[in-house]
């Protein structure tokens, strides 16, 4: 899977979308997990409703919410009041029994609030040692696409 980058502003909300084939993943609950290290496990943050039929209901765990459009095939995660410590690598997952299939790998970046003049030294960006060569950036800040930029994130 390629990694898709979503950028949000500290203190604001960030919405992450994970498209999927609704027929392929029919009846399957979804989850949002945080990758612990490059090869480490993915720690569950929040999952959709226990009853798949009710997956459209938003479920919260702390400041993170998840909702699933099972017909349209879009999983949406909302990170409310984004903080520097929220930055990192995540996954959208489709659950099947004890299995979890990766729908999308997501890199969350937290940008400094331009109205906040405090030291931005604790804001996290991927270091040079971390490889996200194929990453595609999706800004939560509205802007027009640059020439030649892909309008829709690549999926594999």
């Amino acid at each position: 899977h390629n990694t898709t980058v979503f950028q949000g502003v500290a203190g604001q909300s960030l919405q992450v979308s994970c498209p999927y084939d609704s027929m392929k993943h029919w009846g399957r609950r979804k989850a949002w997990c945080r990758q612990l290290g490059e090869k480490g496990p993915c720690q569950r943050v929040v999952s959709t409703h226990n009853l798949w039929l009710l997956s459209f209901l938003r479920r919260w765990n702390g400041s993170t919410a998840i909702t699933d459009d099972t017909l349209g095939g879009t999983l949406t995660i909302t990170l409310r009041n984004l903080q520097p410590h929220d930055a990192g690598l995540y996954q959208c997952q489709s659950l099947h029994g004890s299995e979890a299939d990766t729908l999308r790998k997501v890199l969350v970046e937290v940008l400094a609030d331009p109205l906040d003049h405090r030291d931005a030294g604790d804001l996290w960006f991927p270091g040079e040692s971390e490889s996200f060569e194929d990453a595609h950036v999706e800004h939560s800040i509205s802007r027009s696409l640059l020439e030649g930029e892909i309008p829709f994130p690549p999926t594999s």
């Epitope: 029919w26 009846g27 099947h96 029994g97």
Partner: antibody, heavy 126, light 107 residues
Framework: EVQLQQSGAELVKPGASVKISCKAS????????MSWVKQRPGKGLEWIGQ????????KYNGKFEGKATLTADKSSSTAYMQLSSLTSEDSAVYFC???????????????????WGQGTLVTVSA | DIQMTQSPASLSVSVGETVTITCRTS??????LAWYQQKQGKSPQLLVY???NLADGVPSRFSASGSATQFSLKINSLQSADFGSYYC?????????FGGGTKLEMN
């Protein structure tokens, strides 16, 4: 009406390979997981693996990794299973079966097998 | 992998009798279990899905119950059409597995 039509019986030599087919009709072939099941003479059912024709994604029973290769051709709505390095242990009837999938709008997985092919007998003999 | 233990392996019964087949799974599969009937030389046919629901066209003399790790299939007033083999099957994640089967033979 959903139908799964499998290819005819095969007599193959030990060490050879065989490719059997399952032609689907009566539904959107790309949108449903297709499984393959093995049944040795007088024995029970064994799940080999499954393929999602929409994108070619496959899942295998570890026991059949390297033995079975699942493919699908969307243009002809046909699923295939190739069995390699055949031995007498591979002599069996092989069924293709389609999951219920999105025909069921309930609160559980819909991965039971609602539709089955008629079976293909593979005999491995010198 | 989830193991499935089906019992009895075979049963010699007469028309009109009541039969119960059980299936035990090594892990909780919730209600993600199906039952199939197979006649000699034929493909399996779906009898029960999601642990307790009868498939279309299945006679009401069949009933199924259970959840988690213990499941059963009951046939009341056995008919001649009911002889054959029965298999349970879990679909709680891959690899899917089947029970070893129960063969119903005429006494």
């Amino acid at each position: 009406e959903v139908q799964l039509q499998q290819s005819g019986a095969e007599l193959v030599k030990p060490g050879a390979s065989v490719k059997i087919s399952c032609k689907a009709s009566g539904y959107a072939f790309s949108n449903y997981w297709m499984s393959w099941v093995k049944q040795r003479p007088g024995k029970g059912l064994e799940w080999i693996g499954q393929i999602y024709p929409g994108d070619g994604d496959t899942k295998y029973n570890g026991k059949f990794e390297g033995k079975a290769t699942l493919t699908a051709d969307k243009s002809s709505s046909t699923a295939y299973m190739q069995l390699s390095s055949l031995t007498s242990e591979d002599s069996a009837v092989y069924f293709c079966s389609r999951e219920k999938g999105a025909d069921y709008y309930g609160s559980t997985y819909s991965a039971w097998f609602s539709y089955w092919g008629q079976g293909t007998l593979v005999t491995v003999s010198a | 992998d989830i193991q499935m233990t089906q019992s009895p392996a075979s049963l010699s019964v007469s028309v009109g009798e009541t039969v119960t087949i059980t299936c035990r799974t090594s892990e909780n599969v919730y209600s993600n279990l199906a039952w199939y009937q197979q006649k000699q030389g034929k493909s399996p046919q779906l009898l029960v899905y999601a642990a307790t629901n009868l498939a279309d066209g299945v006679p009401s003399r069949f009933s199924a119950s259970g959840s988690a790790t213990q499941f059963s299939l009951k046939i009341n007033s056995l008919q001649s059409a009911d002889f054959g083999s029965y298999y349970c099957h879990h679909f709680w994640g891959t690899p899917y597995t089947f029970g070893g089967g129960t063969k119903l033979e005429m006494n």
